[in-house]
């Protein structure tokens, strides 16, 4: 999906309301020095590229973000305002369906949701120059 | 506007299944999750689960251990809630509800359909 | 499950009066993330209170929320009419989304 149309400040509107709390309260506990980050993106629709793909699509040892408050809520607001984007994740979804069994926070996971905290930030601060 | 217009009254025996449908207008249909909420004779609201229409992906309240199955109809802008093996504490008013972003951008149910009542004896 | 206590379960207010709900939640949550619905007998919840403190559209000034973590509040400054009704908290923190047993404003 391209990102490129989306409603940007409203998005971010919507991340700095309620989904920003949504991931403190999942990783909290860890520390915020606890995991590096090490992936980045250079501007809005790369961020909202690198978010939907750290939320939605399961990796080796974390398989289980999708059903969580924050991803519900991205997942809301991606769709309300990114035209198309609902209809476009309607085969990703059918795709992912086994994977998303069983609940289970584990470090992959809490390593996983640090990354995409790093990457709302920079989603909220478009202008700042890539390190 | 938003309007979300539910099926009608349903009078069930024990065992059986119901399904209760919620016709949406106004809106983006497949971009917002669907909620069912119901409420037993003078009691409070009891959330059942919620849909996504764009991909038919779904949140159940395990307190329904497997009965409630909720489905969408985008050609028809309609999501439905079937609930099986029903028993007599299962008598109560259906409400849909749509979740979205407030003016505010907090998210909460913002439109709720005028509710369906469904009764369960033998 | 997140569970939501509210108290008193009725209030018996005399019109013009101030009438003050309180919303208990089970563990902490962001106040961003504790709404309230008003109900009238034989109709549908209506969204009033989002995000703790933000009146929905069309909702009067005599209404305010606060809080925060574990304690909620709704507060009616001077109660009119239409404001006799049940009015429930709930949470969008965590599935099962959890809704408080109600309280019922009547009056006195």
């Known amino acids: 999906y391209d990102f490129t149309n989306c409603d940007f400040e409203k998005i971010k509107a919507a991340y700095l309301s309620t989904i920003s709390k949504d991931l403190i309260t999942y990783m909290s506990g860890t520390k915020s020095t606890e995991f590096n980050n090490t992936v980045s993106c250079s501007n809005r629709p790369h961020c909202l590229t690198e978010i939907q793909s750290l939320t939605f699509n399961p990796t080796a040892g974390c398989a289980s973000l999708a059903k969580e408050m924050f991803a519900m809520k991205t997942k809301a607001a991606l769709a309300i305002w990114c035209p198309g984007y609902s209809e476009t994740q309607i085969n990703a979804t059918q795709a992912m369906k086994k994977a998303r069994k069983s609940k289970v926070t584990t470090n992959k996971c809490l390593e996983q949701v640090s990354q995409l905290q790093g990457l709302w930030r920079r989603f909220n601060r478009p202008l700042l120059k890539q390190q | 506007q938003v309007q979300l217009v539910q099926s009608g009254a349903e009078v069930k025996k024990p065992g059986a299944s119901v399904k209760v449908s919620c016709k949406s207008s106004?809106?983006?249909?497949?971009?917002?999750?669907m909620n069912w909420v119901r409420q037993a004779p003078g009691q409070g609201l009891e959330w059942m689960g919620q849909?996504?229409?764009?991909?038919?992906?779904?949140t159940y309240n395990g307190n329904f251990k497997g009965r409630v199955t909720m489905t969408r109809d985008t050609s028809t802008s309609t999501v439905y809630m079937e609930l099986s093996s029903l028993r007599s504490e299962d008598t109560a008013v259906y409400y849909c509800?749509?979740?979205?972003?407030?003016?505010?951008?907090?998210?909460?149910?913002?439109?709720w359909g005028q509710g369906t009542t469904v009764t369960v004896s033998s | 499950e997140i569970v939501m206590t509210q108290s008193p379960a009725t209030l018996s207010v005399s019109p013009g009066e101030r009438a003050t709900l309180s919303c208990s939640v089970s563990?902490?949550?962001?106040?961003?993330?504790l709404h309230w619905y008003q109900q009238k007998p034989g109709q549908s919840p209506r969204p009033w209170i989002f995000?703790?403190?933000n009146l929905a559209s069309g909702i009067p000034a005599r209404f305010s929320g606060s809080g925060s973590g574990t304690e909620f509040t709704l507060t009616i400054s001077s109660l009119q009419s239409e404001d006799f009704a049940v009015y429930y908290c709930?949470?969008?923190?965590?599935?099962?989304?959890?809704f408080g047993g109600g309280t019922k404003v009547e009056i006195k």
């Open positions: 995000g703790t403190s």
């Open positions: 106004g809106y983006a249909f497949s971009s917002y999750w």
């Open positions: 849909i996504f229409p764009g991909d038919g992906d779904t």
């Open positions: 709930q949470q969008w923190s965590s599935y099962p989304l959890t």
């Open positions: 563990s902490s949550i962001s106040s961003s993330n």
């Open positions: 509800a749509r979740s979205g972003f407030d003016y505010g951008y907090f998210y909460a149910m913002d439109y």
